[in-house]
């Protein structure tokens, strides 16, 4: 969950408790099991590049 008092993440990004910051949903293509990817499921990600593991 996002920490209380912090601004919501911008469109195309989602909060990561593991990293303690908003993360670009496009990153879910690199690592689909990242904690923030659940919050990305409803919104299409920003444009992405090919990814590495």
């Amino acid at each position: 969950e996002q920490a209380p008092g912090t601004a919501p993440c911008s469109r195309g990004s989602s909060w990561s408790a593991d990293l303690d910051k908003c993360m670009d949903c496009a990153s879910c293509r690199a690592r689909p099991h990242s904690d923030f990817c659940l919050g990305c499921a409803a919104a299409p990600p920003a444009p992405f590049r090919l990814l590495w593991p």
């Epitope: 990561s16 990293l19 993360m23 670009d24 990153s27 992405f48 990814l51 593991p53």
Partner: antibody, heavy 120, light 112 residues
Framework: QVQLVQSGAEVKKPGASVKVSCKAS????????IAWVKQAPGQGLEWIGE????????YYSEKFRGKATLTADTSTSTAYMELSSLRSEDTAVYFC?????????????WGQGTLVTVSS | DIVMTQSPLSLPVTPGEPASISCRSS???????????LYWYLQKPGQSPQLLIY???NRASGVPDRFSGSGSGTDFTLKISRVEAEDVGVYYC?????????FGQGTKVEIK
């Protein structure tokens, strides 16, 4: 350039503990995951667990929960793995590896490995 | 946990000839986003593993084009079009679909 430099070989007695270090350089330490992988003599690769250095959040393989403890020191950009209650089957080379969560990642990086020998 | 199974476990090769390694996963590595999370690593003697192929078919930076990856959701192949002496070592398949991160048993490639 990105580098992961691990501490030197260790010889320990059964029942003892050992702490292996992995010093990162060439990138922002808190932006990437550090994973630890075991390779027993003549065997394959086995994931132990991983840590998010910025928050200290950890994920462990069930097999290594209680055996390995992962920590990170952001002031020195160093990740650590401590193995407790050592037994002969813990004799192995242990690797740290940088893993990504980013879409613009350019390859992965591994430390050179640390040989831990458990012998009475 | 996803189980990765490789074959053969040992592969004697002749320089200049093609070689092929198979890997099977216990569940599909094809994600709903269309990406297949299968990776190939090479561990040369006395060295750390190095990434060869990511997401089933993409060559990592600096990897020669004689290496190629292909497959479906559960069955994968690494091909070396013309083996060179420097290609010897142990090849591992692995997945990145979920935790735990698991590897195949490894295929040892050696020159005949």
């Amino acid at each position: 350039q990105v580098q992961l430099v691990q501490s030197g070989a260790e010889v320990k007695k059964p029942g003892a503990s050992v702490k292996v270090s992995c010093k990162a350089s060439g990138y922002t330490f808190t932006d990437f995951i550090i994973a630890w992988v075991k390779q027993a003599p003549g065997q394959g690769l086995e994931w132990i667990g991983e840590i998010y250095p910025g928050t200290g959040r950890t994920y462990y393989s069930e097999k290594f929960r209680g055996k390995a403890t992962l920590t990170a020191d952001t002031s020195t950009s160093t990740a650590y793995m401590e193995l407790s209650s050592l037994r002969s089957e813990d004799t192995a080379v242990y690797f740290c590896a940088r893993r990504t969560i980013y879409y613009d990642y350019d390859g992965d990086y591994w430390g050179q490995g640390t040989l831990v020998t458990v012998s009475s | 946990d996803i189980v990765m199974t490789q074959s053969p476990l040992s592969l004697p090769v002749t320089p200049g000839e093609p070689a092929s390694i198979s890997c099977r996963s216990s569940q599909s590595l094809l994600h709903s986003n269309g990406i297949t999370y299968l990776y190939w690593y090479l561990q040369k003697p006395g060295q750390s593993p190095q990434l060869l192929i990511y997401q089933m078919s993409n060559r990592a930076s600096g990897v020669p084009d004689r290496f190629s990856g292909s497959g479906s959701g559960t069955d994968f192949t690494l091909k070396i079009s013309r083996v060179e002496a420097e290609d010897v070592g142990v090849y591992y398949c692995a997945h990145n679909l979920e935790l735990p991160w698991t590897f195949g048993q490894g295929t040892k490639v050696e020159i005949k």
